[in-house]
């Protein structure tokens, strides 16, 4: 896509581990869990432990210009790249995305995109060509997700914007579903 990196920094996502244990599969797939009726899926916190500081899923914040052919966004956009092992923080090396699984004999967890958002961008084109308007899909948040089978070290890669398409960022909605109503409330609940 011809991205130009502008700036980046990292944030560690530390799940609130004791509060929301991972729901059993039958609950996650429960037919009543549709987004419009129940305001979205339950929070995804897959670990049950007392030591919150032991787990880490990093959100790397990248500020970049978006390009489309010869055209470039008028302003940079900020997006996330998900990285980290979702294992004990003490086992995470300095080089993000490298290292060993924290619990190789047990279930594996991975830091992957959770939600995405769409952002309007205006693209400026050279030679006096008319500007373009596009909507770009950006990763909005990351989560630790249980992998269904063991992945060995050689398969590990950071999850960047092209690596996986996350689910859309459904915000919790009030029961009376309105047309962009209660926006401030929704922003606070995100």
């Amino acid at each position: 896509q011809g991205w130009q990196a502008f700036k980046n920094d990292a944030t560690e996502i530390i799940p609130e581990l004791g509060e929301y244990p991972e729901p059993p599969p039958e609950l996650e797939n429960n037919k009543t869990m549709n987004r419009a009726e129940n305001g979205g899926r339950p929070p995804h916190h897959p670990f049950e432990t007392k030591d919150v500081s032991e787990y880490s899923c990093r959100e790397l914040h990248f500020t970049r210009y978006v390009t489309d052919g010869q055209c470039r966004s008028a302003k940079p956009v900020t997006e996330l790249v998900c990285s980290g092992q979702c294992g004990p923080a003490r086992l995470l090396p300095n080089a993000i995305g490298r290292g060993k699984w924290w619990r190789p004999s047990g279930p594996d967890f991975r830091c992957i995109p959770d939600r995405y958002r769409a952002q309007r961008v205006q693209l400026l084109c050279p030679g006096g060509a008319a500007p373009r308007a596009r909507k770009v899909r950006l990763v909005a948040s990351c989560k630790c997700k249980r992998l269904t089978r063991f992945h060995n070290q050689s398969e590990l890669k950071d999850f960047g914007p092209e690596a996986a398409r996350p689910q859309k960022g459904r915000k919790p909605r009030p029961r009376a579903r309105g047309a962009k109503a209660n926006q401030a409330e929704l922003e606070n609940a995100y």
Epitope: A118, R120, G169, R173, K180
Partner: antibody
Framework: EVQLVQSGAEVKKPGASVKVSCKVS????????MHWVRQAPGKGLEWMGG????????IYAQKFQGRVTMTEDTSTDTAYMELSSLRSEDTAVYYC??????????????WGQGTLVTVSS | QAVVTQEPSLTVSPGGTVTLTCGSS?????????PYWFQQKPGQAPRTLIS???DKHSWTPARFSGSLLGGKAALTLSGAQPEDEAEYYC?????????FGGGTKLTVL
């Protein structure tokens, strides 16, 4: 490739409700932004509502506000559009349509085959 | 709610050029309305020809192009073919709410 398969034709009485389903295959429903469009016989297309990924919420056309409910069952990758208090002018073909799965957000790229809803006493 | 206007009908000769337009009751149509153009043939679901003013899709024939023209969105068909006879709809984005135009019936003869 995204494919959308809608439920079969329905005949309803005025005042009743109808629930049309749209089954997604090729991708999961959470990866897509689903919209609903209807077309009365011999008339044009009319947007009813859909998911807005900018705000992360489902929004409805003012005309249908309070009468339409769009829901999704992620366990079966099926979207639903329920329209209540039906009247004869709601007789139309109802389409579901989704965006494309790619870097740029493009809506209405894939369409269901349409569901004819007839409202008649 | 905004009203989106299109020519009710247009006729073009085979091989000829025709431009369909799409106006907004709120004023000038801009790139920030992300204009879409759809083609619909009798008994079929619509299909997208153009997104975001001028962005063609893999299935869009090269003879179709989108632009802004005189404060309206425009769909230009250059070198019309008999199979282009259809109803054409534009769609404008008003901050996440969409409004279709009334459609243009294009006849190729």
């Amino acid at each position: 490739e995204v494919q959308l398969v809608q439920s079969g034709a329905e005949v309803k009485k005025p005042g009743a409700s109808v629930k049309v389903s749209c089954k997604v295959s090729g991708y999961t429903l959470t990866e897509l932004s689903m919209h609903w469009v209807r077309q009365a016989p011999g008339k044009g297309l009319e947007w009813m509502g859909g998911f807005d990924p900018e705000d992360g919420e489902t929004i409805y056309a003012q005309k249908f506000q309070g009468r339409v409910t769009m829901t999704e069952d992620t366990s079966t990758d099926t979207a639903y559009m329920e329209l209540s208090s039906l009247r004869s002018e709601d007789t139309a073909v109802y389409y579901c349509a989704t965006d494309t799965v790619g870097y740029w957000e493009k809506f209405f790229q894939h369409w269901g085959q349409g569901t004819l809803v007839t409202v008649s006493s | 709610q905004a009203v989106v206007t299109q020519e009710p009908s247009l006729t073009v000769s085979p091989g000829g050029t025709v431009t369909l337009t799409c106006g907004s009751s709120t004023g000038t149509v801009t790139i920030d309305h992300y204009p879409y153009w759809f083609q619909q043939k009798p008994g079929q679901a619509p299909r997208t020809l153009i997104s975001d003013t001028d962005d063609k899709h893999s299935w869009t024939p090269a003879r179709f192009s989108g632009s802004l023209l005189g404060g309206k969105a425009a769909l230009t068909l250059s070198g019309a073919q008999p199979e282009d006879e259809a109803e054409y709809y534009c769609l404008l984005d008003y901050g996440g709410r969409f409004v279709f135009g009334g459609g243009t019936k294009l006849t190729v003869l």
